[in-house]
């Protein structure tokens, strides 16, 4: 697994280098997570033909995966920094149960899956420091998450493969939208 941002030897070996700003650190963290997702997607696609699944088939699911919408204020039209930041943090918190599900779903990329999960927790902390209106952020109910996790793990193998593929695809799209929005802040 790649070394998380801020932990590579170059940072230690170059004390004269300017420390990263909060925004740069967040940007780097998201890009690091996206690299991890790419590696996981590669294993998923090599293992089965899930990656050829049609958008229609993937749309027929009952997963409530976070998705950016116009009202969230993260798109160029109608951009709203505070609303968007709340959406990004809330969405990442909602993704956490799905990232927990991904653990044990990978044979050769177990460490990578763990790295994506842990790096997302760090990203949430970075963003919470940036947010002014923390009260507007709703945390998912742990009991609901626990029963969702149990339900996902009870699915047959094909459904679990499809679910894994969809989570990775949706998380990638959510992070890419977040990255674009955060660069406007």
């Amino acid at each position: 697994a790649p070394v998380p941002p801020g932990e590579d030897s170059k940072d230690v070996a170059a004390p004269h280098r300017q420390p990263l700003t909060s925004s740069e650190r967040i940007d780097k963290q998201i890009r690091y997570i996206l690299d991890g997702i790419s590696a996981l997607r590669k294993e998923t696609c090599n293992k089965s033909n899930m990656c050829e699944s049609s958008k229609e088939a993937l749309a027929e699911n009952n997963l409530n995966l976070p998705k950016m919408a116009e009202k969230d204020g993260c798109f160029q039209s109608g951009f709203n920094e505070e609303t968007c930041l709340v959406k990004i943090i809330t969405g990442l918190l909602e993704f956490e149960v799905y990232l927990e599900y991904l653990q044990n779903r990978f044979e050769s990329s177990e460490e990578q899956a763990r790295a994506v999960q842990m790096s997302t927790k760090v990203l949430i902390q970075f963003l919470q420091k940036k947010a002014k209106n923390l009260d507007a952020i709703t945390t998912p109910d742990p009991t609901t998450n626990a029963s969702l996790l149990t339900k996902l793990q009870a699915q047959n193998q094909w459904l679990q493969d499809m679910t894994t593929h969809l989570i990775l695809r949706s998380f990638k799209e959510f992070l890419q939208s977040s990255l674009r929005a955060l660069r406007q802040m």
Partner: antibody, heavy 119, light 111 residues
Framework: EVQLQQSGPELVKPGASVKMSCKAS????????MHWVKQKPGQGLEWIGY????????KYNEKFKGKATLTSDKSSSTAYMELSSLTSEDSAVYYC????????????WGQGTSVTVSS | DIVLTQSPASLAVSLGQRATISCRAS??????????MNWFQQKPGQPPKLLIY???NQGSGVPARFSGSGSGTDFSLNIHPMEEDDSAMYFC?????????FGGGTKLEIK
């Protein structure tokens, strides 16, 4: 052709244990989950649990925890189920069944192993 | 657990006529466009024979007179025309998730 060949009938005494086998052929054994199902004479079907031969991960019906133990042997492409502390309630036919994969592969069942518990 | 309610419990149909067996699930057995409902036929002393998988696909060697339909929570097995050899027990089963669950069975006889 996918085939599951189960071991022969067993007549066992109460309190004893029994271990039955399910030999798979015609597919990659480690790529599919193997389930076990119980059917008492003249009754319906009841899921016991499954084993994933790739990593030996198991999942059991709460009712059969402590009663059934699922194992597998990759080298011989064989799944096993051991039943312990047998009583007359365990007299039944036990089936192994390979899980399908989406609409591409159908489930496939063995012919069953009959277990009779009697003193 | 997903509960499957099968009806009727028994059914007598004349040769050449249509037999319809229903199976209702307590929650949807669909996922990503596939309905994980299977139908089995069982004769005394024999293992269950897979007739229909994923709601409407025929098992290998299954005659065309057996057909399955439905999605979500409501499914049915149709046999038409009814033949002598079709007298047996029929079960529905969901394989969407564990525990696998089964309907109570329908005893189909010749009228």
């Amino acid at each position: 052709e996918v085939q599951l060949q189960q071991s022969g009938p067993e007549l066992v005494k109460p309190g004893a244990s029994v271990k039955m086998s399910c030999k798979a052929s015609g597919y990659t054994f480690t790529s599919y989950v193997m389930h076990w199902v119980k059917q008492k004479p003249g009754q319906g079907l009841e899921w016991i649990g499954y084993i994933n031969p790739y990593n030996d991960g198991t999942k059991y019906n709460e009712k059969f925890k402590g009663k059934a133990t699922l194992t597998s042997d990759k080298s011989s492409s064989t799944a096993y189920m051991e039943l312990s502390s047998l009583t007359s309630e365990d007299s039944a036919v036990y089936y192994c069944a390979r899980e399908g994969y989406g609409n591409l592969e159908r489930d496939c069942w063995g012919q069953g192993t009959s277990v009779t518990v009697s003193s | 657990d997903i509960v499957l309610t099968q009806s009727p419990a028994s059914l007598a149909v004349s040769l050449g006529q249509r037999a319809t067996i229903s199976c209702r699930a307590s929650e949807s057995v669909d996922g990503f466009g596939i309905s994980f409902m299977n139908w089995f036929q069982q004769k005394p002393g024999q293992p269950p024979k897979l007739l229909i998988y994923v709601a409407s696909n025929q098992g290998s060697g299954v005659p065309a007179r057996f057909s399955g339909s439905g999605s979500g929570t409501d499914f049915s097995l149709n046999i038409h025309p009814m033949e002598e050899d079709d007298s047996a027990m029929y079960f529905c089963q969901q394989s969407k998730e564990v525990p696998w669950t089964f309907g109570g069975g329908t005893k189909l006889e010749i009228k």
